[in-house]
Every structure is written in C-alpha cells, then in structure tokens.
C-alpha cells in the first residue's frame, strides 16, 4: 500500500539537490581559496540534518546552526550589498565590484541560491513533489527558515555604509514583507552602521521622476531613522550604463548622472 | 567517465579572434568550475582563468583581462574560451581542465587541447 | 603572482635510478602544490595533489612531500615509461601558477 504523501502548494525540491549543494561547495572553495578549510562532505551532511525527518513546517533557525557554524565566513563588513526584487542586477554589480558581496557571493548563500528543498517528517526521503509554500502552507518551511536565518547573520555583520539595490519597477518598491523588509532591515547594528545608502533601480528608459520621493522609500527612511541609523537614496536612472560605468569608471560619459 | 572534449586546431590572423569550445560529458558541466591554461610551444603551462558555468561567474588572469571572454552554454553542456586581437605571442596550445572530487584542487581531467597559429 | 621555481629544468637518468625534482614558491602555498607530468603532444596529467596524495591510479613509485614553500617531487625507480616533462603547480591562491618544468630522459 502506497504510503500517503503531504501534497503542499508549493514547488518539490530542485531536482540533484543533494549532488548541486555538494557540487556548489567544491566550487565555491576552488573559486575562494581562503575557504579551503571546509569540508564539503561535512557541509551536506549539516545541510541535510537541518531538514531531513523533520516536519516541513516545523524547521527552526536552531535546526540550521550546525550548517551555519561551519559555514562561517568573514566577509568586509563595509563592503555589504542588500538588495530587494533586483536579484540579477546586484549580482552583475559584484561580479563586476569585486570587493563587494550579495549574500549569494557568500558560501552559504551560494549553496542555496534558487534552490527549493524539504524533507518528511519521520522519514530520511527528500519530499521531490512538493514543498510548503510559503503564504499557502506555513512560513516555517525550510527555505523560507534558512534565507531568514542567513539574512540575520547577515545585516549582523553589516558596518559602516550599507547598501541596498532596491527594484523601482515594483509598486512598493521598499516592502515591508520582503526578506530585507522584514529581516535585514531589522537587523542592522545601529552601533555599526552608520547610514543605509538605497540605490533605487529604475527599470523605464524615459523614466525621470525622482523616486527617491516615493512614499515606501519614505517608509524605509523613517524605519531606518528609528534605529538612528542614517539613510541616503540615490537614482540609478540607467542601470546597463551604471553597470557599464563600474566596470570602466574612467569612461567619459560616466561623469554625468546614471 | 568525465571527458572533454576540445574543437579543432584553428589558424588565424594578427587581430583576429579565437573561439575556442570544450564539450563535457560523464558530469553535468554547472557542477565544476571550467579553467583554460595555454601552453606556447616546447614552453611551461599559464593558467588563463576560470567560468563558472552555473551563473557564467569569471576569473581571468590579469594578463588576459580585456582579450579573453569565457562562456557556458550548459544546454550543450560545451564551455567556450575566445581570445581577441591576436597576436603571434598567443601561438599555443589552449586546453580546458576541471578538478574533481578526490584530487584537491588539482586537475584531473584535461581536454585534448586545442592549437591555435597566429601567423600572417 | 606567486613564482613556482623548479629544478633542475632537465635531468637525465637510468632505469632504476631514483629520481627527485623541486619547486620553491616565492610565499606560503600551504601544502597546495600539485603535480603533472606532460608527454609530448598530450595533455598534462595529474600525478599528486595537495602536496603528497597520489591521485588515483597512479603507480606508488611517484610520491611528494613538503609544505609552506619548499616542495620535493621523487619517482622511486625510474621506467623508461617515465619519459615526460613534469610540472608543479600551486592551488593555493589565484592566478594559478606552474612552475617552468623539469625534462626527464633516460641515459
């Protein structure tokens, strides 16, 4: 008799999981030497005890902490790009900066990056049909509890001037209920940082308007004033120029506003 | 078993380009950062730089930087090393190589390599 | 860069004979040094990774040893097989280096 199965709403786990995690590893410490020291294998294991015979919507940010201690990784704490709803242009930017770092340019972030996982309670099998969605299902779902645990640690890490790449093409450009809304923002050091500097993306070509005045971003500010940490917002009017202009600073036409 | 395998040998005028394809097979070709080494003739290897092929991430070695543009097409599962404004000093053998999983961050698997003459 | 400094650059010995090549980084690579030998017309082929472990298949007479910045690489008994260029390389931080190679013949 075929056992029954918990049908959630959302996406199963991402198909090779287990083989893309161990594959992401290998080359994440090939590509940064200076993590050498991890033990890809120990990596997986850990990855996999923080969901695997657990309920789906039962998994806490303490199930993870083994993979977060092996995990840890010391990045420029000046150096901290957030962004919210712009995922692809924040990571062209620091491919581009490479003094910079997204979450996804750390270890951790990169293992999971676009990844769907979950496992069944009392059993050792990856739930590959589905996953707990989280709006439809419950929230503490094993993606949803990793990306809030990452994220913490890492606006907790954040100093000096940190940026957020924010998606003026969205209706609430700054949202509450995203994961740099309801987690990041949140969890900036006001003893460490100083200001938030907000660079909102514009997405049209004729598109002028100042959106720095946009009432989310005034949001953004009060919440951020709050934690009496500073706020500053630029335009990025051109994002292809902007990008163009990081990668050749000394371009003639990177003087003027991009 | 893990393959690569290189084009053809090409040859090609000063400031012409180079492009230069490595076609993987027994692995999934995003599970592996793609490196490319050159080799001049009856000389010692120089490491070129690397793709990761999965986000199209690269690392090219200053000396390079500006001329050499690293590409994966992981539909064909074939990664690509085009070498621009060529010049006679970029005669060599071109080879792509990956580690693996018992070997550090040696490189156990090697394509066959793939001649380039840059002569007028 | 770090410089990969091999000697000697050629060596001519006889069956049987031991043989040894050394590489000195120009910093600490830790014990990330691998080594390849390379036959004319082929492409490299890696005989030791990080510093001492015999990649797999390959004949125990082929060994390395070292650390930090000296490094030795040793066939124990030389086969005419053995005929090849080796090279070393460090791992251990970007760009890559080899070091310029070691030509071994038999007399």
């Known amino acids: 008799v075929p056992r029954w199965r918990q049908q959630w709403s959302g996406p199963g786990t991402t198909k090779r999981f287990p083989e893309t995690v161990l594959a992401r590893c290998v080359k994440y410490t090939e590509i940064h030497p200076e993590m050498r020291h991890v033990d890809c294998q120990s990596v997986w294991d850990a990855f996999k005890g923080a969901f695997i015979s657990k309920h789906p919507c039962n998994i806490t940010e303490e199930d993870y902490q083994p993979l977060m201690k092996l995990g840890t990784q010391t990045v420029p704490c000046n150096k901290i790009l957030l962004w919210s709803r712009i995922k692809d242009l924040a990571h062209q930017f620091t491919q581009v900066q490479r003094d910079m770092f997204t979450l996804e340019d750390t270890l951790l972030g990169y293992l999971a990056d676009d990844l769907t996982w979950c496992g069944e309670f009392n059993t050792s099998k990856i739930n590959y049909q589905s996953c707990p969605d989280w709006r439809k299902d419950c929230s503490n779902n094993p993606v949803s509890v990793f990306w809030k645990t990452v994220s913490r640690r890492f606006a907790e890490a954040a100093c000096d001037v940190v940026h957020v790449m924010l998606n003026g093409s969205r209706s609430k450009i700054f949202d509450k209920n995203s994961t740099f809304g309801s987690v990041e923002v949140h969890n900036l050091q006001p003893e460490k940082v100083q200001t938030l500097e907000a660079w909102v993306i514009h997405g049209g070509r004729e598109d002028s308007r100042d959106l720095c005045q946009d009432p989310t971003i005034k949001e953004l500010e009060s919440i951020i004033s709050k934690r009496n940490i500073q706020f500053s917002c630029k335009n990025i009017y051109r994002p292809d120029k902007f990008l163009q202009c990081v990668k050749n600073p000394e371009d003639s036409s990177c003087t003027s506003e991009i | 078993q893990v393959q690569l395998v290189q084009s053809g040998a090409e040859v090609k005028k000063p400031g012409a380009s180079v492009k230069v394809s490595c076609k993987v097979s027994?692995?999934?070709?995003?599970?592996?950062?793609m490196n490319w080494v050159r080799q001049h003739p009856g000389k010692g290897l120089e490491w070129m730089g690397w793709?990761?092929?999965?986000?199209?991430?690269?690392d090219v070695a200053q000396k390079f930087q500006g001329r050499v543009t690293m590409t994966a097409d992981t539909s064909t599962d074939t990664a690509y090393m085009e070498l621009s404004s060529l010049r006679s000093e970029d005669t060599a053998v071109y080879y792509c190589?990956?580690?693996?999983?018992?070997?550090?961050?040696?490189?156990?698997?090697w394509g066959q390599g793939t001649t380039v003459t840059v002569s007028s | 860069d770090i410089q990969m400094t091999q000697s000697p650059s050629s060596l001519s010995a006889s069956v049987g004979d031991r043989v040894t090549i050394t590489c000195q980084a120009s910093q600490n690579v830790d014990s990330d040094v691998d080594w390849y030998q390379q036959k004319p017309g082929k492409a490299p082929k890696l005989l030791i990774y990080?510093?001492?472990n015999r990649y797999t298949g390959v004949p125990s007479r082929f060994s390395g040893s070292g650390s930090g910045t000296d490094f030795t690489f040793t066939i124990s008994s030389l086969q005419p097989e053995d005929i090849a260029t080796y090279y070393c390389?460090?791992?251990?931080?970007?760009?890559?280096?080899f070091g310029g190679g070691t030509k071994v013949e038999i007399k």
């Open positions: 390389a460090q791992s251990n931080t970007h760009p890559r280096t």
């Open positions: 190589a990956r580690t693996g999983y018992n070997s550090g961050y040696g490189f156990p698997y």
């Open positions: 027994g692995y999934t070709l995003t599970d592996s950062v």
């Open positions: 793709i990761d092929p999965e986000y199209g991430r690269t």
């Open positions: 990080k510093a001492s």
